[in-house]
């Protein structure tokens, strides 16, 4: 069958019936339903919440929703037991306590099972001892202090600023300073935007907010006890003791009027520099310990939450491809919140949720996709993407043979300034193609595309006229697909402006203030920018569900691959006498880039020439179109990170959220100037190199003609 | 200096209704969350409403809501509120008051202003 | 709603007197608590925000301590101005409610 005899309709007319019938009233009617209480992963709320959505999909039109449930570790507070911070004075009496728990926002103060504030995943402890200020905990302010400075923190209790980098990653480089404990807090520098008020009056994080979060270092796992497979009914699951990615010291989170308390004292060290110092009333002094007349205070944590293996459930429904079922587009979210969700994540499930019911209308009216198009809301994503993976690990040789694209849709807005898009070269110019056709919703765009305004606000710094597109890290459901499985993958919100907001994240994220009315009143009263996301992700969805040909462009993976290039050599290059000493040469990688470069190019000819009508012909270039993604993937994955398996672009080591190019090569070359054995290091630069020029070589080859 | 200075007590028949009014001056008004807060003959405070910076949020004692209606005019610095069918119950002495956010302290008072709901 | 307990409701104290007055919250509020000072006739006045903090010209002889759920109001050294009633308040979610107050009255 050709594409037309899948359907009713025309090609274009299709996707212009299929955008028509998304409309932001239903949007925001989603969103306020999925937004009145809280729907915590593993929770009974969660589960109701699921067969809902399990029941609406099938009302909407998809041929089957299924629940597919697994028993994960997860990680909760100790109800009679709260966790918090004190300062305890000589006698061991605690003279100040945090706070158990953010005052509810007007309208949710009989609202139960909100959970306190905490670190999922925290081990229990109550270690007490002198503070050190870390700034943001990255592994260059580790390296000022221990380097630079000659602060030891060792045995010491750190405390962080949220923001810049992972909380997880955070963790991980405290707890390999020597760290007892961790202590999180949002400093308004970060949460709070100047000329904008607090909730409930706008959307500043007050300071009683605190941003929830797991602080796993998994790094693609899923669920600590059964990495690599699925947590079913008869998994084999490690001891605790053996579990992937779970921290080994105590951490808890706390917001700014809290931390005020902890940093007004302390004394030792001066910051190094500006950028150390937040926007407290206090001096930002590292530490170790308190000033003088305080100097016999310590700071004490109790935390007592506990890890539980608990069964969590994604919905998965499905609309049956026409021609090619065997073929899967998926359109993926996750359904868990830490509190109320209203942007995180309920509005993507809102969006995803009127996408389904689109493309349900079209069904209801006899059409169906070329291509089979799966949706799901995941669940446990806020405890480490554990719904998504465990999900992708249990079908995986289905979504490797069958996987065409992904497409995340975790919260649809950030901002409300423009578009943002991290997705693979191989979708470049279908985001640029479909946000041509879109209308922007931007003030002063009105009658232009979504194309002008995202490129006018957020323009590319390579090529002109075009607007940026990002590289796709981690920190949400895409991971398993994009760095494990290798199948190409995109997500799309509506973000704030970077150059003037230099706040990490939205203000409100992950705390009890993420509510409905935050959104309907301060982000999107009109839904607009939603409804402009669930064009973009509809969009991406219907077209490659759709498109006789799959909209990829190899020659756009061609043109980011030399860069990266470029890119990982110029870093090399800062060491050019070892490189000489050691031979280390980048000529291997340069040449298959080349290699790359002419072949996609000929690919893409041959995909302009070729008989569409021959489904033989057809189904074989869009299974090398389908298939360039898996060819990046290295089966042996990344130096101890099993699980990021893709050469190209992987989370980076130092910040779980940020996409790097050329992991590989990159993690070798980090900090080699420290290393103890440079011969060891430089050699394990040229493996990576090694690695990288064979595996663009050999996804170069699934380019070239088959015969 | 800082001053509140409510108006429009009175006595009223119970069912009838009332209009309380507060002048603020010395103080950015428009940087500050206002409240009334009543005080009955020989009682305690009780908290009747609130409105934030630009009234565009208004809260109520629960018991309240329906019969009362609080709301400003930044560009007078002025606060009122509305009293429809008043009981005997709402004789109090109404103080207006003011705070710098939703979880604040009432850091300024009115001197108040008596209402008295009698037949 | 969370309810505020003053206790006592009233006490008789001499000057120079250290007095002590305790405030409940029925459920746990942090820090976010107020104490006022009403003097007959007159409009209540700030004299402790945040548990502990003195409000600008509150004199040093009162000091306020406490979290979660129970809080204290001390006046160190009773003067003869001080004969009044004295409130807690909570902050921390709507309805902000009173304590029934506490009348200091001359022994």
């Known amino acids: 069958k050709s594409s037309n005899e899948a359907t009713n309709i025309t090609p274009k007319h299709n996707m212009k019936a299929f955008l028509d019938e998304l409309k932001a009233e239903n949007i925001k009617k989603f969103l306020y339903n999925f937004t009145q209480i809280p729907h915590l992963a593993g929770t009974e709320q969660n589960f109701q919440l699921a067969k809902q959505i399990q029941s609406q999909w099938k009302e909407f039109g998809l041929d089957s929703v299924e629940l597919a449930h697994y028993d994960v570790l997860l990680s909760y507070p100790n109800k009679t037991h709260p966790n918090y911070i004190s300062i305890i004075n000589e006698d061991g009496n605690e003279i100040f306590n945090t706070s158990l728990f953010e005052p509810p926002p007007p309208g949710y103060e009989n609202v139960s099972d909100i959970v306190p504030p905490f670190s999922a995943f925290s081990p229990q402890g109550m270690p007490e001892g002198d503070l050190v200020y870390v700034n943001y905990a990255r592994t260059e302010d580790f390296f000022k202090l221990e380097r630079d400075m000659k602060i030891n923190c060792s045995g010491k209790i750190v405390i962080a600023r949220y923001g810049k980098v992972f909380r997880g990653n955070k963790v991980k480089n405290a707890q390999l300073a020597g760290a007892k404990g961790v202590i999180l807090y949002s400093d308004p520098a970060d949460y709070f935007a100047p000329g904008v008020k607090s909730y409930p009056d706008g959307w500043n994080l007050p300071g009683g907010g605190v941003q929830r979060g797991n602080i796993l270092n998994l790094n693609g796992a899923g669920d600590p006890l059964t990495p690599g497979y699925p947590a079913n009914e008869y998994a084999y699951r490690r001891g605790i003791a053996e579990a992937v990615g779970l921290p080994s010291i105590p951490v808890h989170p706390i917001g700014y009027y809290d931390a005020q308390k902890l940093l007004e004292k302390m004394g030792g060290s001066a910051p190094p520099d500006s950028s150390w110092r937040g926007s407290l009333k206090v001096p930002y002094n590292v530490g170790p310990g308190f000033t003088g007349n305080f100097s016999t205070q310590k700071v004490k944590m109790h935390i007592h939450s506990t890890n539980e293996v608990t069964r969590i459930y994604n919905v998965i429904g499905t609309l049956r491809g026409a021609v090619e079922p065997d073929r899967y587009v998926i359109l993926g979210g996750h359904r868990d919140s830490w509190v109320f969700g209203g942007i995180d994540p309920q509005s993507g499930a809102a969006v995803v949720h009127e996408i389904v019911r689109s493309f349900g209308t079209l069904k209801k009216e006899g059409w169906r996709p070329r291509r089979t198009i799966l949706f799901a809301s995941w669940d446990a994503e806020e405890f480490g993407l554990l719904g998504s993976t465990e999900w992708a690990e249990e079908n995986s040789r289905l979504l490797q043979e069958r996987g065409v694209a992904y497409i995340n849709a975790d919260s649809s807005i950030e901002g409300n300034y423009t578009l943002r898009v991290d997705c693979t070269p191989l979708m470049y110019s279908l985001v640029h193609n479909l946000t041509k056709e879109l209308k922007s919703p931007d003030e002063g765009f009105e009658g232009k595309s979504l194309y002008e305004s995202w490129t006018k606000k957020s323009p590319s710094p390579e090529f002109s006229g075009m607007p940026r597109i990002s590289k796709l890290g981690s920190g949400n459901d895409f991971e398993v697909f994009f760095q494990r499985l290798g199948i190409a993958s995109g997500r799309a919100r509506y973000t704030k402006n970077w150059e003037t907001n230099k706040f990490s994240g939205y203000p409100l994220y992950h705390s009890v203030y993420e509510t409905y009315e935050l959104v309907e009143k301060f982000y999107d009263p009109m839904f607009k920018y939603h409804l402009t996301v669930a064009q973009v992700r509809g969009g991406m969805v219907f077209e490659l569900a759709n498109s006789i040909v799959l909209p990829f462009d190899c020659r756009d993976y061609a043109v980011v691959l030399r860069k990266y290039a470029d890119k990982i050599y110029s870093i090399s290059m800062k060491h050019p006498q070892e490189m000489k000493t050691y031979s280390v040469s980048f000529d291997s990688l340069f040449s298959a880039v080349k290699n790359f470069t002419e072949i996609a190019s000929k690919f893409s000819e041959r995909l302009q020439d070729f008989d569409k009508s021959n489904p033989i012909v057809l189904r074989m270039m869009n299974d090398q179109l389908m298939f360039l993604e898996r060819a990046f993937i290295d089966p042996l994955g990344l130096p101890d990170r099993p699980f990021y398996r893709h050469v190209i672009y992987a989370p980076s080591s130092h910040n779980k959220y940020a996409g790097e190019s050329f992991p590989g090569i990159y993690d070798a070359l980090f900090d080699i100037e420290s290393k103890v054995d440079p011969s060891k290091a430089w050699g394990e630069v040229k493996r990576q190199i090694y690695v990288a020029a064979f595996t663009v070589q050999a996804a170069a080859e699934t380019l070239s003609e088959v015969a | 200096e800082v001053q509140l200075v409510e108006s429009g007590g009175g006595l009223v028949q119970p069912g009838g209704s009332l209009r309380l009014s507060c002048a603020a001056s010395g103080f950015t008004f428009s940087d500050y969350y206002m409240a009334w807060v009543r005080q009955a003959p020989g009682k305690g405070l009780e908290w009747v409403a609130s409105i934030n910076y630009d009234g565009s949020s208004t809260y109520y004692l629960d018991s309240l809501k329906s019969r009362f209606t609080i709301s400003r005019d930044n560009a007078k610095n002025s606060l009122y509120l509305q009293m429809n069918s008043l009981r005997a119950e709402d004789t109090a002495v109404y103080y207006c008051?003011?705070?710098?956010?939703?979880?604040?302290?009432?850091?300024?008072w009115g001197q108040g202003t008596l209402v008295t709901v009698s037949s | 709603d969370i309810q505020m307990t003053q206790s006592p409701s009233s006490l008789s104290a001499s000057v120079g007197d250290r007095v002590t007055i305790t405030c409940r919250a029925s459920?746990?509020?942090?820090?976010?608590l107020a104490w006022y000072q009403q003097k007959p006739g007159k409009a209540p006045q700030l004299l402790v925000y945040?548990?502990?903090t003195l409000a600008d010209g509150v004199p040093s002889r009162f000091s306020g301590s406490g979290s979660g759920t129970d809080f204290t109001l001390t006046i160190s050294s009773l003067q003869p101005e001080d004969f009044a009633t004295y409130y807690c308040q909570h902050f921390w979610s709507t309805p902000p409610t009173f304590g029934g107050g506490t009348k200091v009255e001359i022994k």
């Open positions: 008051a003011g705070s710098d956010g939703y979880w604040a302290w009432f850091a300024y």
């Open positions: 945040n548990a502990e």
């Open positions: 459920g746990n509020i942090h820090n976010y």
